[in-house]
């Protein structure tokens, strides 16, 4: 399984490694794993049209910025085929090091 | 079959401005970023630029002003101005790799001569 | 600006034995790090990308490692067709890049 290693509070990118054929196009949510289940991660649609131009690679990461101990775990993206039936999915580790004992919470935000 | 290849290297004096081309098969231009690298005899791989699916362009900052990437739906163009000797090179076309697993995507042509001598 | 810094420049290896490259970023890339081989007369093959993806048809001595700012090529059981140039590469960003490749290093098979 992939890993990103990050300092806390820096910014972390973390690739979608679903299978995904970059002549299509696909809609992407981002969820992180958690023992208890699944716990959506907030990926506001204002960012789909970001002028921020990412290499066509980046393509539906997700960017955590000011990442503390409480943003490590497993992260799941989802790809659904715009106007077609296959849905993708990948999954990445994030572990942050370094980071004081009070956590405070992350922000998030994606490319595309 | 997926392919690139680059040409319209040659022999150049000092000043001459010189277009190389490269040209894709089997994939769409749409949907991938192309670079094109040199590489002067005995040295290493040198970013020139990129472009992306969408057009956007991006340079190396020695590169700015001097160089230009376009497409067209088939070729990717390198438009140089004012050749130097210090542009001799192996000039390489490649596709980037697109993102996703189980096929990587990178595609590099064989690389196109161009020497400038006076 | 994103700077790729690889070490070392030049590294001589028996056969059988093992070789590790380092490549270190000036800035986080996260995973977005390939490596290539290049021999003379030829244009650069992927060996491994997403900074630990084999790619395919490359043999398993090949591993990579790493992410953020630091990456690793380790070569085992080296061979003497492995004797070439490798560099590493930054896909991460193209924005206030000078080069978004490493310098190269050179392995000598003894």
């Known amino acids: 399984m992939r890993e990103v290693t990050v300092a806390c509070s820096e910014t972390a990118d973390l690739p979608c490694t679903a299978p995904w054929d970059p002549q299509l196009s696909y809609a992407v949510s981002w969820a992180k794993v958690s023992e208890s289940g699944t716990e959506s991660v907030e990926l506001p649609e204002s960012k789909q049209n970001s002028s921020f131009e990412a290499p066509r690679r980046r393509a539906y990461s997700l960017t955590i910025q000011n990442t503390t101990i409480c943003s490590s775990g497993t992260y799941r993206c989802a790809l659904q085929e715009l106007g077609g039936q296959r849905n993708l999915s990948g999954t990445v580790v994030l572990k942050v090091t370094g980071c004081p004992k009070e956590a405070t919470e992350s922000t998030f935000r994606k490319y595309r | 079959c997926q392919s690139v290849e680059e040409s319209g290297g040659r022999l150049v004096t000092p000043g001459t401005p010189l277009t190389l081309t490269c040209t894709v098969s089997?994939?769409?231009?749409?949907?991938?970023?192309m670079t094109w690298v040199r590489q002067a005899p005995g040295k290493g791989l040198e970013w020139i630029g990129i472009?992306?699916?969408?057009?956007s362009t991006y340079y190396a900052s020695w590169a700015k002003g001097r160089f230009t990437i376009s497409k067209t739906s088939t070729t990717v163009d390198l438009e140089v101005t004012s050749l130097t000797t210090e542009d001799t090179a192996t000039y390489f076309c490649?596709?980037?790799?697109?993102?996703?697993?189980?096929?990587?995507?990178?595609?590099w042509g064989p690389g196109t001569l161009v020497t400038v001598s006076s | 600006a994103y700077d790729m810094t690889q070490t070392p420049a030049s590294v001589e290896v028996a056969v059988g034995g093992t070789v590790t490259i380092k490549c270190q970023a000036s800035?986080?890339?996260?995973?977005?790090l390939d490596w290539y081989q290049q021999k003379p007369g030829q244009p650069p093959k992927l060996l491994i990308y997403?900074?630990?993806d084999l790619a395919s048809g490359v043999p398993s001595r090949f591993k990579g490692s790493g992410s953020g700012t630091q990456f690793t090529l380790t070569i085992s059981d080296l061979e003497c067709a492995d004797a070439a140039t490798y560099y590493c590469?930054?896909?991460?960003?193209?924005?206030?890049?000078?080069?978004?490749f490493g310098g190269g290093t050179e392995v000598v098979v003894k």
């Open positions: 490649s596709r980037e790799h697109a993102g996703y697993s189980g096929d990587t995507g990178h595609l």
């Open positions: 089997g994939f769409s231009l749409s949907s991938y970023d």
């Open positions: 472009i992306y699916a969408s057009g």
């Open positions: 800035q986080s890339i996260s995973t977005y």
């Open positions: 997403d900074a630990s």
């Open positions: 590469q930054q896909g991460y960003t193209h924005s206030n890049v000078d080069n978004v």
